[in-house]
């Protein structure tokens, strides 16, 4: 990890405790005032690799709401709305962090968890061509 | 909110602090056991629309390095390898949740964040305004 | 129940043509992808052709392409296969199968199978 | 193509034994593997799709997992019933293909 050097304003905590048990402001800052992400909302129907939105919730789980992606076809979609038989359609994965509580139900302990959701769908060629 | 009966054994908050500050331990859990995402680390190349993969990093945010995904074309890859300025690649987004670290270097004092994260990319057709 | 039942096989000569037909009952036939599949005596199981849900996409393998026609009238609930320039190696049960979603990968119904024999 | 290479062609097992078959996939195939079993003169029938999920009313004796190039078809507890010719089929590039077929049999 990177050494970071430790600022006298920080709140204390003992080593023993370090990295594992952090202090988490739950005040979330928003960095996406300058992007709107409803504008890539109906990409979901336009795309040729198009994908239905289904909705994840787990109240042990913050946040307890997440979004995942299925694709529609197999195949990917032609021009005039039919199946392309020759190209897939596939999820596109990210790796997320989630906070899930620990112990169950307590209301301010959290551990840190990874997920991996599908956020939508692109079309791939199946088969790669090696050339000699 | 959920309304989540408190556990007796839950760490003990003052309700001042709650829920604005709560204890994260870091020791990820990863629930992917069962998928591979490696596996689809090859779909940004194969797709109709592919996209490469910058580094960002930042030292005050966990975790430090995260992918962005940038859309090579503004068209769409056809069969032949030429590319399709009638449809669009674009980029799909999410937020996702970061730890900021609050105040500046603090290693065990964080806030939540919410910053908006390209993916991959997918075609799409363009959406034709008919004038009057 | 769904039901498939495929009929016009039979004993044609090399180079004849023959169609098959299949009758779909039990399901809205329009919104699925149909195929047909076939296995030749004491062999294993070969796609012939594919098509969806409302035949505006067809798929055939290179070892009927140009020869076989697969289509479908959704008001007849009925897929058919047009076989033309039959040779000995098309000698085969012909089956007709369903596909659970509109397009036509895997197939969760199948109908009894039609024998087409190619001989001189 | 996609060739798919199935093992073993034929196996002789005991009741309530446990069975596996291998498929294997000329390159990545992304988990469009379905297997079906097909009993002598009868049309095939499908047991798994998407790699490992079972179909509605298939019993839960028979499962399938695998990735990649490498599938496995499993019947946990192997039942009179059960004999029959499996086959695995890949949908992830065309022409779909199909295993030559695993034939079991009891012992």
């Known amino acids: 990890g990177i050494a970071i050097p430790r600022n006298s304003g920080c709140p204390n905590s003992e080593d023993k405790n370090f990295p594992r048990t952090v202090m988490v402001n739950l005040n979330i800052h928003n960095r996406n005032t300058s992007t709107n992400p409803k504008r890539s909302s109906d990409y979901y129907n336009r795309s040729t690799s198009p994908w239905n939105l289904h909705r994840n919730e787990d109240p042990e789980r913050y946040p307890s709401v997440i979004w995942e992606a299925k694709c529609r076809h197999l195949g990917c979609v032609k021009a005039d709305g039919n199946v392309d038989y020759h190209m897939n359609s596939v999820p596109i994965q990210q790796e997320i962090l989630v906070l899930r509580r620990e112990p169950r139900h307590c209301p301010n302990s959290f551990r840190l968890e990874k997920i991996l959701v599908s956020v939508g769908c692109t079309c791939v060629t199946p088969i790669v061509h090696h050339v000699a | 909110g959920i309304a989540i009966p408190r556990n007796s054994g839950c760490p003990n908050s003052e309700d001042k602090n709650f829920p604005r500050t709560v204890m994260v331990n870091l020791n990820i859990h990863n629930r992917n056991t069962s998928t591979n995402p490696k596996r689809s680390s090859d779909y940004y190349n194969r797709s109709t629309s592919p996209w490469n993969l910058h580094r960002n990093e930042d030292p005050e945010r966990y975790p430090s390095v995260i992918w962005e995904a940038k859309c090579r074309h503004l068209g769409c890859v056809k069969a032949d390898g030429n590319v399709d300025y009638h449809m669009n690649s674009v980029p799909i987004q999410q937020e996702i949740l970061v730890l900021r670290r609050e105040p500046r270097h603090c290693p065990n004092s964080f806030r939540l964040e919410k910053i908006l994260v390209s993916v991959g990319c997918t075609c799409v057709t363009p959406i034709v305004h008919h004038v009057a | 129940e769904v039901q498939l039942v495929e009929s016009g096989g039979g004993v044609v000569q090399p180079g004849r043509s023959l169609r098959l037909s299949c009758a779909a009952s039990?399901?809205?036939?329009?919104?699925?992808?149909m195929s047909w599949v076939r296995q030749a005596p004491g062999k294993g199981l070969e796609l012939v052709a594919i098509?969806?849900?409302?035949?505006?996409?067809?798929f055939y393998p290179d070892s009927v392409k140009g020869r076989f026609t697969i289509s479908r009238d959704n008001s007849k609930n009925t897929l058919y296969l047009q076989m033309n320039s039959l040779r000995a190696e098309d000698t085969a049960v012909y089956y007709c199968?369903?596909?659970?979603?509109?397009?036509?990968?895997?197939?969760?119904?199948w109908g009894q199978g039609t024998l087409v024999t190619v001989s001189s | 193509d996609i060739q798919m290479t199935q093992s073993p062609s034929s196996l002789s097992a005991s009741v309530g034994d446990r069975v596996t078959i291998t498929c294997q996939a000329s390159?990545?195939?992304?988990?469009?593997l379905a297997w079906y079993q097909q009993k002598p003169g009868k049309a095939p029938k499908l047991l798994i799709s998407?790699?490992?999920s079972l179909e509605t009313g298939v019993p839960s004796r028979f499962s399938g997992s695998g990735s990649g190039t490498d599938y496995t078809f499993t019947i946990s507890s192997l039942q009179p019933e059960d004999i029959a010719t499996y086959y695995c089929q890949q949908y992830w590039s065309v022409p779909w293909t199909f295993g030559g077929g695993t034939k079991v049999e009891i012992k």
């Open positions: 039990g399901f809205t036939f329009s919104t699925y992808g």
């Open positions: 998407g790699a490992t």
């Open positions: 199968a369903r596909d659970p979603r509109h397009d036509g990968y895997f197939f969760d119904y």
């Open positions: 390159e990545d195939i992304y988990d469009r």
């Open positions: 098509i969806n849900h409302n035949g505006g996409s067809t």
